[in-house]
Each structure stands twice: as C-alpha cells, then as structure tokens.
Amino acid sequence: IWELKKDVYVVELDWYPDAPGEMVVLTCDTPEEDGITWTLDQSSEVLGSGKTLTIQVKEFGDAGQYTCHKGGEVLSHSLLLLHKKEDGIWSTDILKDQKEPKNKTFLRCEAKNYSGRFTCWWLTTISTDLTFSVKSSRGSSDPQGVTCGAATLSAERVRGDNKEYEYSVECQEDSACPAAEESLPIEVMVDAVHKLKYENYTSSFFIRDIIKPDPPKNLQLKPLKNSRQVEVSWEYPDTWSTPHSYFSLTFCVQVQGKSKREKKDRVFTDKTSATVICRKNASISVRAQDRYYSSSWSEWASVPCS
Amino acid sequence: RNLPVATPDPGMFPCLHHSQNLLRAVSNMLQKARQTLEFYPCTSEEIDHEDITKDKTSTVEACLPLELTKNESCLNSRETSFITNGSCLASRKTSFMMALCLSSIYEDLKMYQVEFKTMNAKLLMDPKRQIFLDQNMLAVIDELMQALNFNSETVPQKSSLEEPDFYKTKIKLCILLHAFRIRAVTIDRVMSYLNAS
C-alpha cells in the first residue's frame, strides 16, 4: 500500500481467483481513543470500532472511502483504491490504446518547437467518476524538473456508436535550452482513477522525436505573367524555434486537384517560395518539417488555385 | 531523406555542403545498422545515450546562436579554448567564438573518426561479417575535417590486444551512430546559421 495523495491510498493486488489479497491497517486521524466506529462509503453498516481498523482487501467491495466517526461526528477519511495486476501485468482498463505509432500506446505527445514545451493527450470512453493527474521529469534516476498543468477534456468525438473523450495536458521543461542535445528522455507519468480503480500510464521520449511544427503561415499565390505558373510563398510558423537560420525547416509543396484520384504534384524545397503550375479547381498545400531531424511533418496549409 | 532538393550554391559558406553530406551519410548508416542489427537493441528507445565528446568538447555551447545566449539554460559551460586557423572562416568577419565553435566541431569529428576506425577494425574480424562502417561516411567525415582545416595533434588509433566481443561492439556501434547523428544535426544547424550570418 502506498499514499497517492493525502488520505488516498493505493493497494496493489495480484488479481486471480481466490487471491489472498492484502491486509491493510487504517488509523483514525484523531487524538480520541474511545468510542470510534468505522464505516465504508458504499455500505451503511458499522465495520468495526477502535482507533485502528484492520481489513483484508481482496476486491473492489473492500475498496472505497473508509470513515471513522465518534458520536455522529466524522473524524477522518481514508480512501482506498485498487491497482490490479493480472499475470504480472498492470491493468489498462481506463485509457484506449491509440495503436499509433505502435501497440500499447496510451499517451501521445507532440511539441511545436524546441522550447521544452509539449502537449500530451490520451483517449477514453469513460466520462464519469474519472480523474487524472500528471507528473513529468527529464530522466528518472536524477530527475530534472518539468512542470505540467492540469489535464483537461480537450475534445469529444463520436466513433461509431460510442463517444470518445480526449484529455490533454501541457508541460514545460523548467530550464530548457532549445539548442541542447538531449541525452536523457522526458518521462511523463499519468495517474488515472476511475471509481475505485487506480492505473498509471507512462511515456518516455526526446523532444526532438515528438517535434511537429505548426503549418506554414501567410501562404500566398502570385501569378506569373503569361504563364500558368504561380509563385507560392509562405513564412515560418510563429511558434517555430528561432533563429530560423539555426532551426531551419524544409517544406513540401503539393498541387492537388479537386478529385482525390488526380495525380498530386509534389516539390520539396528549403526555401520559403516555389514556382508551380496551378491547375483549374486545384489547391496548393504546403507543410513543414525540421530540415535536419526528420520528425513529423506539420499539417498542411492550403489555398485554392483560382 | 530521399527527396529532390536543390543543390547548394557554390558561393555558400564552404562547410555547409560538407555538413549536409555528413548528416545524410550518418543517417543512412544508422538506418542500415538498425535494419542489419534488427535483433540487437539498436533503436533510440533501446540504447543508452552516451556522448563520447562529453567534457572534452563543448560544441553546443561554443556554437550557440547569438539569439540564444540570453537564455540562461543554454549557458551551462562556455569556457572552452581551441587553436584556430580554419579555412571555413571568412577571416575578417570571424569572431573568437566562431573560431572556438568550428574548432570544437573539428575535435568532435576527430574523436568520432578515431572511434569509428577502431570499431571498423574490430568488425572486420567478425566471422559473421554482419556489418561494416560505410566508407562513404568515413570519407565525408574526412572531407569536413579538411574543409575545417585545423591544426591539431593526431589522436592515435586505439588498438586492443584482447579478442573483441562482437555483440558488445555492435551495440557500441549503435550507441555511437545515434550520438553522432545528433551531433551531425547540431553541426548542420551551426553551418546553416553561420552561412546565413
């Protein structure tokens, strides 16, 4: 048993038929010695009396909020949560496996630049009795500080018959140098509590591997005289690391017809302009990627040809 | 990245072209190592990230763009002193820091070159003949070092008498290639920045 936060405890249980469970001793936080009784939130009966209560925690019926009382007055609470381990594997019932980039990916993270700021998100189909808390550090043996905000519900989607909820959190490395070469990964730890079930999820990454620039901005077309060609120009996104001559981007320019079946013309360039042929009803899209370290491409920025 | 990209102008800062070739070569070599050594821990997640230049050179600090010198977190250890007279330097414009930066890059290349050559010698003794270092990568390191053209004591190539542990050598190769790729990215960024200045 270990303390998750004040008055909230996690009991780690090996989950198999007729498992013996874990013996837990609860102590009432009071100077009182006599006349103390104990109750469990989901049952109205008195479980025991005295300053301590010994319980055998085997299943979810044994978890919950234990309260000690004296003469109708509440003295203190202890909330017991269960963390299930089956066949040596901790349960992952709360979050959805996003399966990208690989199976058992519950947390996904992205950074718009090298400032040490990143966002992580996760998915669940649960909407009630659910809480998250997030911690992060650089490295694990001698951790350096990363500060994370509160996890918030960032999107709700209908997937087939089901609602899916996306939660996200923003974190910032306390002392990040954008030019630094990372040798220790960022560790992100999410504590998830659904009802009386505790689970934890972790992700480990280098900022350089989760970079995804914002799309290029100010995408403009300038027709060239007596020609079907146009000059496309754009700018680095505002959120990208500076100076741009050090943190350089490379770009992909695509001309796409109205129909998805039409052949796409693509040009790659390190410049912030390109000359392309603009077909009728086509659109021109540009996306960006770190020039020297091939992490993710940005989303497309698009303008119609007409 | 196997994509059509325009070639650099000949009037560019001479080392930029070499540093781009270096990054391409080390990235290709790393990809080849990952594929060939697929049953070895050779991915970024699996290996220990070691920097053989740690405490010996300080390329990141010495080559920090001016704009980042205001960032406290970037100014951990800026005390470095290296001999200067590189041909990449457009002499009048060169600041003392730029000279330190380029000589630090040169020292990095020299250290990696020695490590890679030592490692290659061991890999050539492997009866499995599973993987060798790409001669192109070694040549590109050499070309960039020549372009930097610094005077520096030659580091003797390490030779070991004991029988090499080929498993360990291959793991070490992966560690070395990952670290060198990261350093090659920094070198490319620096050359791009200096070129723009």
Epitope: D41, G61, D93, T125, S127, D129, K195 | -
Partner: antibody
Framework: QIQLVQSGPELKKPGETVKISCKAS????????MNWVKQAPGKGLKWMGW????????TYADDFKGRFAFSLETSASTAYLQINNFKNEDTATYFC??????????????WGQGTLVTVSS | SIVMTQTPKFLLVSAGDRVTITCKAS??????VAWYQQKPGQSPKLLIY???NRYTGVPDRFTGSGYGTDFTFTISTVQAEDLAVYFC?????????FGGGTKLEIK
C-alpha cells in the same frame, strides 16, 4: 435510514410540462450524485442522466437532451425532473436513484418508489 | 452506446434450483457491471456491483462474475421470494445501459 421519496402519479396532456420531485433523507444530500431512470410500461430500464448534487451540474444521456431538465433544491435535499412538451412516448415510471458512493456515481444503491406519469389524450 | 444482451428472457424454475443469467456487452466494460432485482410493483434493488461484489445485506446465494464482455449472475438455491425481474447494467461508459431483463418465475 436512507430514503428517497418521490411525488405522486401525474396525468398529463400532450404538450404540457410535468415536474417530479425526489426528497432524500438519512444521508448528506450533496455527497452523492442523483440519477434518473425511466421505465416504460412493461419495458426495461433506461438511464436518463444524473445531477451532481454538490455543483448542480446536470449530465443528460443523448436521448434525453432538450425537453428534460434536472434541478435541485439543496436546502430541502430535493432533486427534480422536469419534462417539457410532454409526448405520448414519455408515458412511464420515472425513478430517482442515488449513487452507490461518492466515487461510484452510476451504480444505483437507493431508489425512489417511482412516479408514474401518464399521457391523457 | 454499449448494448447489454441479457439471456434468457424468461426462466421457469423450482425452489431449490440453481439459476444462471448471462449478460454480454457489445464491447469491453472492464468489471463495471451491476445486477439489480425488481419485484412486481417495486423499484429495483442493487444486488451486485463491480461484477462480483455483493451489496450490503444481500444474501450470499446471489453471486456475480465476469470481466470484459461476458458476465454471469447466479442464484445458487432459488427461493420463493426471488420471483422478480433481474437486470444487468454496465456503468463503464455513458450512456449507462441495462440489459433487457430476465423474468424469473417459480413453478
């Protein structure tokens, strides 16, 4: 002991509004969520949604968004269900049901006796 | 929404029999399943929560088991007062859905 007592049966014309009350006693009202469940004659149970008795925030199941409203009178430990623009298909027994615990909102440990609301044509 | 398919719809048994009702969820609901008993003209009563935990005061002849998508409710020795409709309910994901019910009749 813990009790949920609901208001009596109602006979409503289509288009009218009905408001059902559910008075709780025997526990701290604001510690436990209050759910509403519909049971059409001879049919199964359908969860309508719940109201957080501490914050007053209601949550509705998709089928009960729009014409249905949950509310509270905390000082009287009472929860309400209001149905606007009553329709034929709203004829049913409506139950209020208290959550099992502070941590388990949508398992129903205590139920009101039910309020039958019938449409009169 | 998650569909809870409860079988059988009807059960005609004699006192002393063992009865098993099953509930199949259309997707995994972990162990977030409850079982209720509704006697004629009454409101439902909670018997089992978290798939296998008996609620306070519920006789131990009532048991529940299961995880993921398949759940079972058992009355080890049926008694005359067990005449009722039994419902399963998933309380994993909103909307919290009930099975169609199993009507238990005593011969």
């Amino acid at each position: 002991q813990i009790q949920l007592v609901q208001s009596g049966p109602e006979l409503k014309k289509p288009g009218e509004t009905v408001k059902i009350s559910c008075k709780a006693s025997g526990y701290t009202f604001t510690n436990y969520g209050m759910n509403w469940v519909k049971q059409a004659p001879g049919k199964g149970l359908k969860w309508m949604g719940w109201i957080n008795t501490y914050t007053g925030e209601p949550t509705y199941a998709d089928d009960f968004k729009g014409r249905f409203a949950f509310s509270l009178e905390t000082s009287a430990s009472t929860a309400y269900l209001q149905i606007n623009n009553f329709k034929n298909e709203d004829t049913a027994t409506y139950f209020c049901a208290r959550s099992l615990s502070t941590m388990i909102t949508t398992t129903f440990a205590y139920w009101g006796q039910g309020t039958l609301v019938t449409v009169s044509s | 929404s998650i569909v809870m398919t409860q079988t059988p719809k009807f059960l005609l048994v004699s006192a002393g029999d063992r009865v098993t009702i099953t509930c199949k969820a259309s997707q995994s609901v972990s162990n977030d399943v409850a079982w209720y008993q509704q006697k004629p003209g009454q409101s439902p009563k909670l018997l089992i929560y978290y798939a296998s935990n008996r609620y306070t005061g519920v006789p131990d002849r009532f048991t529940g088991s299961g995880y993921g998508t398949d759940f079972t409710f058992t009355i080890s020795t049926v008694q005359a007062e067990d005449l009722a409709v039994y419902f399963c309910q998933q309380d994993y994901s909103s909307p919290y859905t009930f099975g169609g019910g199993t009507k238990l009749e005593i011969k």
